[in-house]
């Protein structure tokens, strides 16, 4: 529902590179949208060598997309499914994913979110926007601006806790997530420790905390002694294959 | 190591300014976002402004809005606090930390006093 | 606004465990999952002991464990010691607040 945020998020995962593509060396300037640095999207959609990025599901894309067959706007029905752009205010949807952060779907049309739609605790517009990517962009019209990162921050690579565009700017053992205020270099799981498995299909939370990925050799599963437990509580951790 | 060293506490009327500075070493300053946290003496901890690694975005408590502001020189490795139209109840340590996973260092403080 | 709960006090002998409990809501510890521990010695800084509800920084006694059960998590000393003796606090996160932190407590390691 539209009432969830979703905040323990592995969304950084061990998925495929992108068609064809090759991601964006650190230092490089990239055409990004603030609040939307996210791994397994397509990432630099405004760049010309855009590839499209495969999805199953809408958490596998960045938070300025949602996963469609791109002959339709809509989930496909069979075929190769695709991260497409999010859609903008005023524009049509069918669900929450499909709009643009700081937007939902309401009555087929992406809408403006205001508070009167989230519970309190949830991120805000202005926040996720202003925390993405550290440029201002509190537009006056809430749309998210395209804007050009260019960092000299990214030419080491980054230690636990260092702001970050993706995992490879990080440190080995590091990958690149979102922790509420911006994107930082976190540890990669190890076994035992907490992580998140995607189940909603058609929900779309504002992601302010991911996790990275189980290490080598582990999986995200759920806990064996949760097996009993409600779906909403089950916990899963990073076990050995 | 990572070392945050804060200075510019002191003794200070009711309606006054301070300015705090915090030395940041050990670390890529610029790489991380910087916080302000301050405890009033006996009393609990209260984050008070934090700051992006650019300078770019900065964001208070409500306590201090428009009183306080956080700046830092990233040249410099330092970060500040401006506090302006202090009250009795700002009376506090005031701790600089960097914002890395969560609160992950902090300075040792500096004593801030409100007092006629 | 967002309040986090904890006991003022606890105390434990040297070789025992002792939970920190952290009250709030389903619409921050609840609902988020995520919570941090802080530990302060008296006239010290704080420092960092549990993120992300059970994760230990590098440095951490693994002594130190965290958890949630619904609206509650929790801090575990095992074999205290008497160096554990400090106040610890819980710390949340909140779009408007930012950090937000319990109220504290007071850790007394007994004999």
């Known amino acids: 529902t539209l009432n969830s945020v979703l905040i323990n998020s592995n969304a950084i995962k061990n998925l495929p590179p992108p068609l064809g593509g090759a991601g964006g060396q650190p230092g490089s300037a990239v055409s990004v949208a603030p609040g939307v640095l996210y791994e397994g999207g397509n990432k630099y959609q405004t760049l010309d060598n855009y590839q499209p990025y495969p999805c199953a599901e809408d958490e596998e894309c960045g938070s300025d997309e949602y996963c469609s067959s791109p002959s339709r706007g809509a989930a496909g029905v069979g075929g190769v499914q695709i991260c497409l752009a999010c859609r903008k205010r005023r524009k049509r949807c069918m669900r929450h994913a499909m709009c643009c952060p700081g937007n939902y779907c309401k009555n087929g049309i992406c809408m403006p979110s205001d508070h009167s739609h989230f519970p309190r605790g949830e991120i805000e517009e202005s926040i996720i926007e202003n925390l993405g990517n550290d440029h201002n962009a509190a537009a006056g019209d809430g749309y998210p601006r395209r804007t050009t990162l260019t960092s000299k921050i990214y030419h080491t690579k980054g230690q636990e806790g260092s702001v970050c565009l993706r995992s490879s700017d990080c440190a080995a053992g590091l990958c690149c997530a979102r922790h509420f205020w911006s994107k930082i270099c976190k540890p990669v799981l190890k076994e035992g420790q907490v992580c998140t498995k995607h189940k909603r299909k058609g929900s779309h939370g504002l992601e302010i905390f991911q996790r990275c990925y189980c290490g080598e050799g582990l999986a995200c599963r759920i806990q064996k002694d949760h097996h009993q437990a409600s779906n909403s509580s089950r916990l899963h951790t990073c076990q050995r294959h | 190591q990572v070392q945050l060293v804060e200075s510019g506490g002191g003794l200070v009327q009711p309606g006054g300014s301070l300015r705090l500075s915090c030395a940041a070493s050990?670390?890529?300053?610029?790489?991380?976002?910087m916080s302000w946290v301050r405890q009033a003496p006996g009393k609990g901890l209260e984050w008070v402004s934090g700051i992006s690694y650019s300078g770019s975005n900065t964001h208070y408590a409500d306590s201090v809005k428009g009183r306080f502001t956080i700046s830092r020189d990233n040249s410099k490795n330092t970060l500040y606090l401006q506090m302006n139209s202090l009250r009795a109840e700002d009376t506090a340590v005031y701790y600089c930390a960097r914002m890395g996973i969560d609160l992950d260092y902090w300075g040792q403080g500096t004593l801030v006093t409100v007092s006629s | 606004d967002i309040a986090l709960t904890q006991p003022a006090s606890v105390s434990g002998s040297p070789g025992q465990s002792i939970t920190i409990s952290c009250t709030g809501t389903s619409s921050d510890v609840g609902g988020f999952n995520y919570v941090s521990w802080y530990q302060q010695h008296p006239g010290k800084a704080p420092k960092l002991m549990i993120h992300?509800?059970?994760n230990r920084p590098s440095g951490v006694s693994n002594r130190f464990s965290g958890s949630k059960s619904g609206n509650t998590a929790s801090l575990t000393i095992s074999g205290l010691q008497a160096e554990d003796e400090a106040d610890y606090y819980c710390?949340?996160?909140?779009?408007?607040?930012?950090?937000?932190f319990g109220g504290g407590t007071k850790l007394t390691v007994l004999g």
């Open positions: 050990g670390f890529t300053f610029s790489s991380y976002w």
């Open positions: 710390q949340t996160w909140d779009s408007l607040s930012f950090f937000v």
């Open positions: 992300d509800g059970s």
